[in-house]
């Protein structure tokens, strides 16, 4: 007897996971036989479509390789033209391991702005996004957050947040991971410590402290009124992101020096600047007690000019007493360059003598000083004309007067030859003949403002200037 | 490199004159910019300077002791001598020798190893 | 007569940064120097014109002098530096003057 199609087997929700199979089964009892029919979203699926089998005269219905976009209500149709056709639906819903869609990337970003790490997900249930970083979970706060679409956060980014990164994508069926990715927090230069700003004798050596930081790590510049230092070592060393930059000058001139931290952040840079002065004390007489030690000269400047088995005073004044004579009596010879033939080598040797003074034998190290008339046989002979010019210089400012009082003795103040022969040097290199004193410029009109005392002549030397003038 | 070295009577009476010399080797006693000086310590004590022979034969000597004290030298030897009377009991000490370099700032950059006297009866 | 005064007795753990001082009017104008003495022998010098080392002694030891107080400092010290460190100088009337001395412990 013919019998109307009854569905026997309701179709049922069915879970299925990607690229897994999934079949739907719908039971029908009628005669004669029903034509079954199926469709997704009340689409027909058709017989010829490959990615489904129909089997059973229909009755079973099986997704070959199930995709994410196979989920949906899926319903069978029975009709055999007795009574009305029947139908059953189910779902199928498509399960899926989380997935991460758009993974982060590394990112490079400024103290103080806002970073965003990417982490776009997919995945059924709904997959929980979490993030690593370094070894350790990351915990959210108020300024790190994770977004619903399971981006990263971090306002305000502070140096500690620099580190290693991967979101973690978890649901009921699996766990994914992103690979690693780099945040680098970059910070504009920051001086942490200024150079200090000193009142020094001329002379002296003095050391220049700059300290910044930033990431990448700063460089540091010298700049000296406005121009890149050209004198003085520079010592720098980095620790710990910090880089201490120390200036050591040797101080003849007052100026500006200033400390430039630059560091460089994609296209653009990051400057910060301390300025520190130096300016130079009006220098004041040795103590009553010399300080210092006793060494053979190991310079250059002097090196004709002083006697080849003396040894040399080195005040301890001075943190590097070699360095700092010879360039003290450096800076006084470049100015002798335009001074006489007759008076160079006169003024040389008085130089070298006066700075690097011999040292007494004695028990304790003492510097013996330039007789005071070999000083005024420079001063008032030699080089009449050039330290009259000199002084009429100095009181006009045009000099740094710090300088000449270091490298030009005070003849008056100088102990004479007459008094005790021992208690002052001679200047063996003053040892003209007669015959030079034609060359010599003529003498100033003015009468030496010394009395230059009679110096008693020598068969040891050739050098005799005058009736009044004999040097030993 | 000089080298110094003391001797003389370990054992000295009181009120007698206590006698060391110091014989210096690798370097001469009238070399410029070298000094020679006396040094004693005391046991248990703190080292005292006693006074010097410069290159040249002048002499200085401690306050607390200028009174007593003597030293003297024989270049032809290459010795320098100390010469301390009226010796007491505190006069026990180690006695070194020393040589004062300016290149040191006359610090005393050689020493003899010491040697000891003691004062008693 | 110059008075020197040095403190009898200064601990420092090993490795650890010693300072022993010398006390004396004005010392800051004059050359001190500083002598290392370990019992049974002779005192050696390790530091001159206040802070020039001589050579053979380590860098560690270095020196400073100033207003009344000269400073004796050892970087790190190490066991064999346990010793009595006396300081030196000169007066302008050509005498010497030591310190009493300061018996460095190295714990």
């Known amino acids: 007897l013919p019998k109307a199609p009854v569905i026997t087997t309701p179709l049922e929700t069915v879970d299925a996971l990607v690229e897994e199979v999934a079949t739907f089964m719908c039971a029908v009892e009628s005669y004669p036989q029903p034509e079954i029919s199926w469709t997704r979203n009340k689409i027909l699926i058709k017989l010829f479509d490959t990615r489904y089998s129909i089997r059973e005269n229909g009755q079973l219905l099986t997704i070959l390789s199930v995709e994410d976009s196979d989920d949906g209500i899926y319903c069978c149709t029975a009709n055999n033209g007795v009574g009305g056709a029947v139908e059953s639906c189910g779902a199928l819903q498509v399960k899926m391991k989380p997935k991460i869609t758009r993974p982060p990337i590394n990112v490079k970003i400024i103290e103080g702005l806002k970073a965003v790490l990417p982490c776009t997900t997919m995945g059924n249930p709904k997959p929980s996004v979490s993030w690593i970083k370094g070894d350790s979970p990351l915990r959210e706060n108020s300024r790190i957050a994770v977004l619903e679409s399971g981006s990263l956060r971090i306002h305000n980014v502070q140096k500690e947040d620099a580190g290693q990164y991967r979101c973690v994508a978890k649901n009921s069926l699996g766990t994914a991971y992103s690979k690693v990715v780099k945040l680098e927090v970059e910070v504009f230069a920051r001086i942490l410590r200024a150079p200090e700003s000193h009142n020094v004798t001329f002379g002296s050596f003095v050391t220049l402290h700059c300290t910044a930081t930033g990431i990448p790590v700063p460089t540091i510049t010298w700049i000296e009124n406005g121009n890149a230092v050209s004198s003085g070592s520079i010592q720098e060393s980095v620790k710990d992101r910090v880089i201490d930059s120390r200036l050591q000058l040797f101080i003849t001139k007052p100026g500006l020096y200033t400390c430039i931290a630059t560091n460089k952040h994609g296209e653009k840079f990051s400057t910060a600047k301390a300025a520190a002065t130096i300016s130079i004390a009006e220098w004041s007489k040795p103590q009553k007690d010399n300080k210092g030690y006793c060494a053979q000269y190991r310079g250059e400047v002097c090196n004709a000019v002083l006697a080849k088995d003396a040894l040399v005073f080195l005040n301890t004044s001075y943190a590097d007493p070699e360095e700092a004579q010879e360039l003290l009596v450096h800076t006084a010879w470049n100015e002798l360059k335009v001074v006489s033939p007759v008076c160079r080598p006169a003024a040389e040797a008085l130089l070298c003598n006066h700075i690097f003074q011999e040292c007494s034998p004695g028990v304790v190290p003492t510097p013996i000083p330039i007789c005071r008339e070999y000083c005024l046989a420079v001063k008032e002979l030699f080089c009449a004309k050039e330290w009259l010019v000199m002084e009429e210089k100095t009181h006009r400012g045009l000099y740094r007067s710090e300088m000449h009082l270091l490298s030009v003795p005070e003849c008056s103040k100088l102990p004479s030859m007459h008094w005790d022969p021992t208690a002052c040097a001679r200047l063996p290199h003053l040892d003209y003949n007669k015959e030079n004193l034609k060359t010599f410029p003529p003498m100033t009109s003015s009468k030496p403002s010394v009395d230059i005392p009679n110096l008693p002549s020598s068969s040891s030397s050739s050098f005799s200037v005058s009736p009044t003038y004999s040097m030993t | 490199q000089v080298q110094v070295q003391e001797s003389g009577p370990g054992l000295v009476k009181p009120s007698q004159t206590l006698s060391l010399t110091c014989t210096v080797s690798g370097g001469s006693i009238t070399a410029r910019y070298y000094s020679w000086s006396w040094i004693r310590q005391p046991p248990g004590k703190g080292l005292e300077w006693m006074g010097v022979?410069?290159?040249?034969?002048?002499?200085y000597y401690s306050p607390s002791l200028k009174s007593r004290t003597s030293i003297s030298r024989d270049t032809s030897k290459n010795q320098f001598s100390l010469h301390l009377s009226s010796v007491t009991p505190d006069d026990t000490a180690v006695y070194y020798c020393a040589r004062g370099s300016s290149r040191v700032a006359a610090a005393f950059d050689s020493w003899g190893q010491g040697t000891q006297v003691t004062v008693s009866s | 007569s110059y008075e020197l005064t040095q403190s009898p007795s200064v601990s420092v753990a090993l490795r650890r940064t010693a300072k022993i001082t010398c006390g004396g009017d004005n010392i800051g104008s004059k050359n001190t120097q500083w002598y290392q003495q370990k019992p049974g022998q002779a005192p050696v010098l390790v530091i001159y014109?206040?802070?020039r080392r001589p050579s053979g002694i380590p860098e560690r030891f270095s020196g400073s002098n100033s207003g009344n107080t000269a400073t004796l400092t050892i970087s790190g010290a190490q066991a064999e530096d346990e010793a009595d460190y006396y300081c030196h100088v000169w007066d302008s009337s050509t005498n010497a003057w030591f310190g009493g001395g300061t018996h460095l412990t190295v714990l």
């Open positions: 014109a206040d802070s």
């Open positions: 022979i410069a290159y040249d034969g002048s002499t």
